[in-house]
């Protein structure tokens, strides 16, 4: 028996359902009574889901997995993972034994888009050219860790005096806070871009300083 999975990682958004595709080619006369199907975590060998003895043995993994029972006899051994969490990320092995066996691993990459950044300025009044200001760009509930870029109004990257921190919350999602310290010009725009490297999603925020008032 030859087991086939997708070469590319499966990308799933947090709280959505994901399908880890796995297939095998049944011989003529194949019956489900002959099938032993095991899904397990590749690294720890923890059991995720199984089908053996001619029946679905059910989920051994937080009751959020399911097979496609009607498609098994055609060689579809795919696994449905419901309400994906950050902790589900990793490699899953699909193991099929009939008379002989084969296995293959498929990677699950979990992702969550970052929120539109909110911008704050300190100090936020009585600003004059030449003042040192601190601009904070905050974006929330994304995964995996973000890449943060700052640019001025002309699109020139600002790399000096940038401090970025990323903190994971109880669900494993990251809140990003990036601080730019800059000396004010006569007027100017400062843009923050928060990029999710998996989703290739960019979230933009900017602040424009034109004397008074400030615009965000």
């Amino acid at each position: 028996v030859e087991v086939q999975v997708s070469e590319d990682p499966v990308v799933a958004l947090v709280d959505t359902d994901a399908t880890l595709r796995c297939s095998f080619s049944p011989e003529p006369g194949f019956s489900l009574a002959q099938l032993n199907l095991i899904w397990q975590l590749t690294d720890t060998k923890q059991l995720v889901h199984s089908f053996t003895e001619g029946r679905d043995q059910g989920s051994a993994y937080s009751n959020r997995t399911a097979l496609f029972p009607d498609l098994l006899v055609q060689g579809n051994a795919s696994l449905r993972l419901q309400r994906v969490r950050v902790t589900d990320e990793g490699s899953y092995t699909c193991f099929v034994s009939i008379q002989d066996f084969d296995s293959a691993a498929v990677s699950l990459q979990v992702a969550a888009p970052y929120s539109k950044p909110s911008m704050t300025l300190e100090p936020n009044k009585d600003l004059r050219p030449g003042n040192m200001v601190t601009i904070t760009c905050s974006s929330y509930q994304g995964y995996p860790e973000a890449e943060v870029f700052w640019k001025d109004g002309q699109g020139v990257p600002l790399t000096g005096n940038v401090t970025t921190s990323q903190m994971a919350n109880e669900r494993g999602l990251f809140d990003v806070h990036s601080v730019l310290r800059v000396v004010l010009g006569a007027n100017g725009t400062y843009s923050c871009l928060v990029r999710n490297p998996v989703l290739q999603q960019d979230a933009h925020g900017s602040v424009t300083i034109t004397g008074q008032p400030l615009t965000f």
Epitope: N36, I38, Q40, K45, L47, T52, D100, D102
Partner: antibody
Framework: QVQLVESGAEVKKPGSSVKVSCKAS????????ISWVRQAPGQGLEWMGR????????NYAQKFQGRVTITADKSTSTAYMELSSLRSEDTAVYYC??????????????WGQGTLITVSS | DIQMTQSPSTLSASVGDRVTITCRAS??????LAWYQQKPGKAPKLLIY???SLQSGVPSRFSGSGSGTEFTLTISSLQPDDFATYYC?????????FGQGTRLEIK
Amino acid sequence: QVQLVESGAEVKKPGSSVKVSCKASGGTFSSYAISWVRQAPGQGLEWMGRIIPILGIANYAQKFQGRVTITADKSTSTAYMELSSLRSEDTAVYYCANGGDSSSWYTFDYWGQGTLITVSS
Amino acid sequence: DIQMTQSPSTLSASVGDRVTITCRASETISSWLAWYQQKPGKAPKLLIYKASSLQSGVPSRFSGSGSGTEFTLTISSLQPDDFATYYCQQYYSYPITFGQGTRLEIK
């Protein structure tokens, strides 16, 4: 390279039970199947049953159904075969066996050294 | 249960001989057949699986063929180390069953 090491020889009385252990090392114990095969003196090979340790599910040959219990302890990578209501015909060498390089659970390229169980009054 | 019948039960041959052992299944088993060699006091050793696939490390003088119900194990040129008992085994369906064995002895 998988190694299977079985417990030592035993002499048992008719009607009693015996439990043989098989400790695996050097391979992925929990995912694969461990079978038990016996061989009476001067006789052929006889498959008794198998267990998939990760599932804890065992299959038995009809001949032994109700008399044999195969279990596995994933934490120690050890499989067990218990045979009850022993009779003199159960005198045999008992092997645990495992498929590996042959890509099958049901062909056996790794064997324990064998455990001789003698049933005698 | 699927019955496996080997012939002959005993085979006398000399070093250098080409020998063939036959195994018949009571019903079709496709190619799900293995061959083992066993020496006295030792565990069996897997030679061939899936009717004709040579197990890693087994000398190429051993070969297997057949499908359905009739299978053969051939040793192209007997070596002194080959005198032993040979078993066929089907793994098409439960329960797994073995042939009764063929003892290969020195003539």
